[in-house]
Interface confidence: medium
């Protein structure tokens, strides 16, 4: 065979962000010539697991019946064909929520904001953390990642949005975590509905969805604008 074997595709169902205790299935899809599939987890002895292919041999299933901290991490898979092992798949990051108590998300001065004005979303945690994530429902990616400098332990992160437009309207949640494992997140905060008034179009309603639901492509990540917070937290765009 000319050249290396094509890399397989790796994904998780129902998604790659799973609540503690829930089940998740990792799928690795290769080619019809695959004889064996291997799953490697970063910083774990390789292989992490091996599976025979399911008919028609082009994919394998790796089951996690109950999500715990041990399963959170970065995975790659390979398949073996008669001519050897494939290239590794692109990595899959399996994130567990529920590792810490849920933070509180609030809007200052109010979740009802006039277009063109400013609002700050404030995520507060019971325990000191060094990383905070803000998620907008139906957005494709985590919106904003704030990590404190020098591992400073904070109880809050500020997400300023200015000037607010109708695009900012919608349902937000936040998570907190420790930098030593960004694969372990807190329970999600209760949802916060940001309502933007005084614009031509009202924000479209965002249905409540579970954290593990795969995000739809309809929203691009929304980047709050404004100055970097003075809270010792560094901004990371995702």
């Amino acid at each position: 065979q000319a050249g290396p074997l094509p890399k397989p595709t790796l994904w998780a169902e129902p998604g790659s962000v799973i609540s503690w205790g829930n089940s998740v299935t990792i799928w690795c899809q290769g080619t019809l010539e695959a004889r064996e599939y291997r799953l490697d987890k970063e910083e774990s002895p390789a292989p992490w697991d091996r599976q025979n292919p399911l008919e028609p041999k082009n994919k394998a299933r790796f089951s996690i019946p109950s999500m715990t901290e041990d399963y959170a991490g970065r995975y790659r898979c390979y398949y073996r064909s008669p001519v050897g092992w494939s290239q590794p798949s692109d990595p899959l990051e399996l994130v567990m929520t529920g590792a810490y108590s849920k933070p509180t998300l609030s809007a200052l001065p109010s979740p009802l904001v006039t277009s063109g004005k400013s609002v700050t979303l404030l995520c507060q945690s019971r325990s000191p953390m060094d990383t905070f994530l803000l998620i907008k429902e139906r957005a494709a990616h985590p919106l904003l990642h704030l990590r404190s400098e020098h591992g400073a332990q904070q109880h809050q992160a500020e997400f300023p949005m200015s000037p607010v437009t109708s695009v900012h309207g919608g349902t937000y949640r936040c998570f907190s975590s420790h930098g030593f494992s960004h694969y372990l997140l807190s329970h999600p905060s209760d949802p916060l509905e940001l309502i933007v008034s005084g614009s031509l179009e009202d924000p479209r309603p965002s249905p409540t969805r579970s954290v593990s639901t795969a995000a739809g492509p309809e929203d691009q990540p929304l980047m709050p604008t404004g100055s970097v917070p003075h809270s010792g937290l560094r901004r990371h765009w995702e």
Partner: antibody
Framework: QVQLKESGPGLVQASETLSLTCTVS????????VNWVRQPSGKGPEWLGR???????VYNLTLESRLSISGDTSKNQVFLKMNRLRTDDTGTYYC???????????????WGQGTLVTVSS | ETVMTQSPTSLSASIGERVTLNCKAS??????VDWYQQTPGQSPKLLIY???NRHTGVPDRFTGSGFGSGFTLTISNVEPEDLGVYYC?????????FGPGTKLELK
């Protein structure tokens, strides 16, 4: 009603270890956070650390190497141990409880009456 | 650590007067600021939590405000029992730190 009471020796020698007990009533240590705060005479309070049954312990980093906080939820008691005492550790030591079980704001809503600790050289 | 500064260091007020106490954090602490009152020989008493919320039983003449790094406590009509030292506390980041206090005296 919520009550916190500190107890321990009033006088300790420098370089020795201070052991204080905070006995609480009117609430469960499995639901609330208890903090230790000290106040040198005529000065402002200083936070030492906290005990939270399901969230772990957090210490003031400047004192962390000398401090140990633990709890016995069945006896409704939280303990503070501070070793290698110095004369500037003299002051009134308080235990406090947060305002509600959410533990987001109002960290020191309820205070004990405090216990005066004098470190002599 | 987050350093809290308070101003003024002390002030004299007449009964019924309106006074404003200021607290400044060296970095943003969100709304994670409480205000405490301490009278001689007593434990500090929580007045305001989360920057602007009155604790149970605190008279409505006490009002807190602020966000980020600037906070104020306003006493609208000073009463004799309001005399004492007022401390602000931040718990936005570890270690939690108190301000040095503002002493309120009677004119």
């Amino acid at each position: 009603q919520v009550q916190l009471k500190e107890s321990g020796p009033g006088l300790v020698q420098a370089s020795e270890t201070l052991s204080l007990t905070c006995t609480v009533s009117g609430f469960s240590l499995t639901s609330y956070c208890v903090n230790w705060v000290r106040q040198p005479s005529g000065k402002g309070p200083e936070w030492l650390g906290r005990f939270w049954y399901d969230e772990g312990k957090v210490y003031n980093l400047t004192l962390e190497s000398r401090l140990s906080i633990s709890g016995d939820t069945s006896k409704n008691q939280v303990f503070l141990k501070m070793n290698r005492l110095r004369t500037d550790d003299t002051g009134t030591y308080y235990c406090t409880r947060d305002r509600d079980t959410m533990g987001i704001t109002g960290w020191f809503a309820y205070w004990g009456q405090g216990t005066l600790v004098t470190v002599s050289s | 650590e987050t350093v809290m500064t308070q101003s003024p260091t002390s002030l004299s007020a007449s009964i019924g007067e309106r006074v404003t106490l200021n607290c400044k954090a060296s970095q943003s602490v969100g709304i994670n600021v409480d205000w405490y009152q301490q009278t001689p020989g007593q434990s500090p008493k929580l007045l305001i939590y989360g920057s602007a919320n009155r604790h149970t039983g605190v008279p409505d003449r006490f009002t807190g405000s602020g966000f980020g790094s600037g906070f104020t406590l306003t006493i609208s009509n000073v009463e004799p029992e309001d005399l004492g030292v007022y401390y602000c506390l931040q718990y936005g980041s570890v270690p939690y730190t108190f301000g040095p206090g503002t002493k309120l005296e009677l004119k």
